[in-house]
């Protein structure tokens, strides 16, 4: 027993005075507390606790159950123990089947022993199966067995606590060893959508995916720059032993303008955090919005192909589109196709391909298109390059000479006089009168030019070309005539064509 | 008339290449998406790819994202399928298909008559 000096409490003192007491079973346990301060004895085994206020711990016929330690306690809150076995040979294990361990920690299998001379007091795998070759352990017949490093792998070991007595090998009741995973990585977090666009009053409704080893990962949906408690429900599965999955579904009912912004799943454990978040775009009504992909102003040559495209944007997803000319709707050679195949994707490409065209097809192309809440158009003016074409070539009666000529862009008129039979008609004229003439075709169509000059400037037999030229090509027409006596007579104008 | 030939089938190596094309006549060529169509042995019709007219636009199937691509040169009025990484799941009959004007990339009006590409080592 302990000695104290004078003036100091001092610790109870126990008969019999030895640590460890063997008694055999049906036998009786006596055991005295001396104390002037005594208060109680405390018996422990498992989990189990026993009081006792009197100084003498009687117990007539020991069981095994009474195996275990026995404290006594004084005022002063020393204590004394002794640790008494009760040998049983039907009953060699107290035992608490119950088994959890984390994993890289030490879990301990609670078999102690009613008897401490047995020997290769062990563990042993269920039905002759060997343990796993790193699983090590420490045996201590007091307390039972204890794990060293659990590893995730040993999740579901099936063991028992083993001794030899009298040569023979006698195991305990079964134990099955649950692991609890510990964390090696953040979280893993995924939201149903990247963003999310929708008009007000419809319902918002966003679901992140939390995947980790076990339940005990923290989840939560916040809003960013925001401390308000979101509404969320959550539904979660264990697929497998370590592989733990939970959905929380963060709800609107009604979204307003003012709640659009950043949402964010956050997830903790104890390895660290991962989030994701969403943005939501509330609008107030649906919208339209074109950008051409050309000039909306184009020149094509004539029998040349052109396409018109355009981007637009719409919310929500369009619901007509079509391409207009003169107040009919293009049946044909046009397309109108998403921009990508992303489930929030908005925009969306039309392409209209004007092939051959002819001089008579300039003018507006509009491209029309609605959804549920607005309509939208965009308008390209296509004009279409031609080569000047001579309308009309004659000598009116005031003796001037007139020719007139269609094309686009704008012909310019030129004259030249050619004396004599020469082919090369050089010598310019100045007209003298030109006019650009209003077109009774579309304001796309053909620009037309009329210029005149003088023939009583002419006073020699010989030829006038008129020659109309735009940046497409030239066409030219001739006026023959000779003179008899005093007379100009007009000889038939004809054209040349020059491409 | 509206005709449609495919070529360039023919047997390649799992992990080759092929490429094949669609000579196009008896419509202008430029104002049409186009697609291209394949049909495994003993199976239904699998959507491929398909290019908008100006080629402006392309969209693939999941089961060949990343390995094939569509093209088309409209001045020679071909359509072109260059297949990469081949598998023996890609081992089909491709068809070139003409689209119709509007909104549905899924609808066709003529068809060729298709070629054979094996995959097999």
């Known amino acids: 027993q302990p000695s104290v000096s004078p003036g100091e409490p001092s610790p109870p003192s126990i008969h019999p005075g030895k640590s460890d007491l063997i008694v055999r079973v049906g036998d009786e346990i006596r055991l005295l507390c001396t104390d002037p301060g005594f208060v109680k004895w405390t018996f422990e085994i498992l989990d189990e606790t026993n009081e006792n206020k009197q100084n003498e711990w009687i117990t007539e016929k020991a069981e095994a159950t009474n195996t275990g330690k026995y404290t006594c306690t004084n005022k002063h809150g020393l204590s004394n123990s002794i640790y008494v076995f009760v040998r049983d040979p039907a009953k060699l294990f107290l035992v608490d089947r119950s088994l959890y361990g984390k994993e890289d920690n030490d879990t301990l299998v609670r078999c102690p022993l009613t008897d401490p001379e047995v020997t290769n007091y062990s563990l042993k795998g269920c039905q002759g199966k060997p343990l796993p070759k790193d699983l090590r352990f420490i045996p201590d017949p007091k307390a039972g067995i204890m794990i060293k490093s659990v590893k995730r792998a040993y999740h579901r070991l099936c063991l028992h606590c083993s001794v030899d007595q009298e040569g023979k090998s006698v195991l305990s009741e079964k134990f099955i060893l649950k692991v609890r995973p510990a964390f090696k990585a953040v979280p893993v977090v995924s939201v149903s959508k990247a963003s999310y666009l929708l008009r007000e009053g419809e319902e918002f409704t966003v679901t992140c995916t939390i995947k980790d080893v076990s339940s005990s990962v923290y989840s939560t949906w916040k809003r960013e720059n925001s401390q308000t408690k979101l509404q969320e429900k959550y539904n979660s599965w264990h697929h497998g032993d370590f592989n733990y999955e939970r959905q929380a579904t963060l709800t609107i009912s009604s979204a307003r303008v003012n709640d659009s912004g950043v949402f964010m799943c956050y997830a903790n454990n104890t390895f660290g955090s991962a989030n994701v978040t969403t943005t939501l775009e509330v609008v107030d009504k649906g919208f339209i919005n074109i950008f051409p992909m050309i000039n909306t102003t184009v020149f094509v040559n004539d029998g040349e192909n052109v396409d018109l495209i355009v981007e637009y944007e719409a919310f929500p997803k369009p619901e007509h589109q079509q391409w207009i000319y003169m107040n009919r709707t293009f049946t044909d050679k046009w397309e109108d196709y998403p921009k990508s195949e992303n489930e929030s994707n908005i925009r969306y490409v039309s392409e209209l391909h004007l092939t051959r065209l002819k001089g008579t097809e300039g003018g507006t192309y509009t491209f029309l298109v609605s959804n549920s809440d607005v309509n939208a158009a965009i308008a390209f003016n296509v004009y279409v390059n031609t080569k000047p074409e001579i309308l009309t070539y004659d000598r009116l009666v005031n003796g001037m000479l007139q020719c007139v000529a269609a094309g686009f862009p704008e012909p310019t008129i030129d004259w030249y006089f050619c004396p004599g039979t020469e082919q090369r008609c050089s010598a310019s004229v100045l007209p003298v009168d030109v006019q650009t003439l209003n077109s009774s075709g579309p304001p796309f169509g053909k620009l037309v030019v009329q210029s005149s000059i003088d023939s009583s400037a002419f006073k020699h037999n010989g030829t006038v070309e008129c020659k109309a030229y735009n940046d497409v090509g030239k066409t030219s027409a001739y006026f023959n005539f000779a003179f008899k006596g005093n007379n100009k007579e007009q000889i038939h104008p004809h054209t040349l064509f020059t491409p | 008339e509206v005709q449609l030939l495919e070529s360039g089938g023919g047997l390649v190596q799992p992990g080759g290449s092929r490429r094949l094309s669609c000579a196009a006549s008896?419509?202008?060529?430029?104002?049409?998406?186009m697609s291209w169509v394949r049909q495994a042995p003993g199976k239904g019709l699998e959507w491929v790819s398909w290019i908008s007219g100006t080629g402006y636009g392309t969209y693939y199937a999941d089961s060949v994202k990343g390995r094939f691509t569509i093209s088309r040169d409209n001045s020679k009025n071909t359509l072109y399928l260059q297949m990469n990484s081949l598998r023996a799941e890609d081992t089909a009959v491709y068809y070139c298909a003409k689209g119709v004007p509007g909104n549905n990339r899924a609808l066709f009006d003529y068809w060729g008559q298709g070629t054979l590409v094996t995959v097999s080592s």
């Open positions: 008896g419509f202008t060529f430029s104002g049409y998406g």
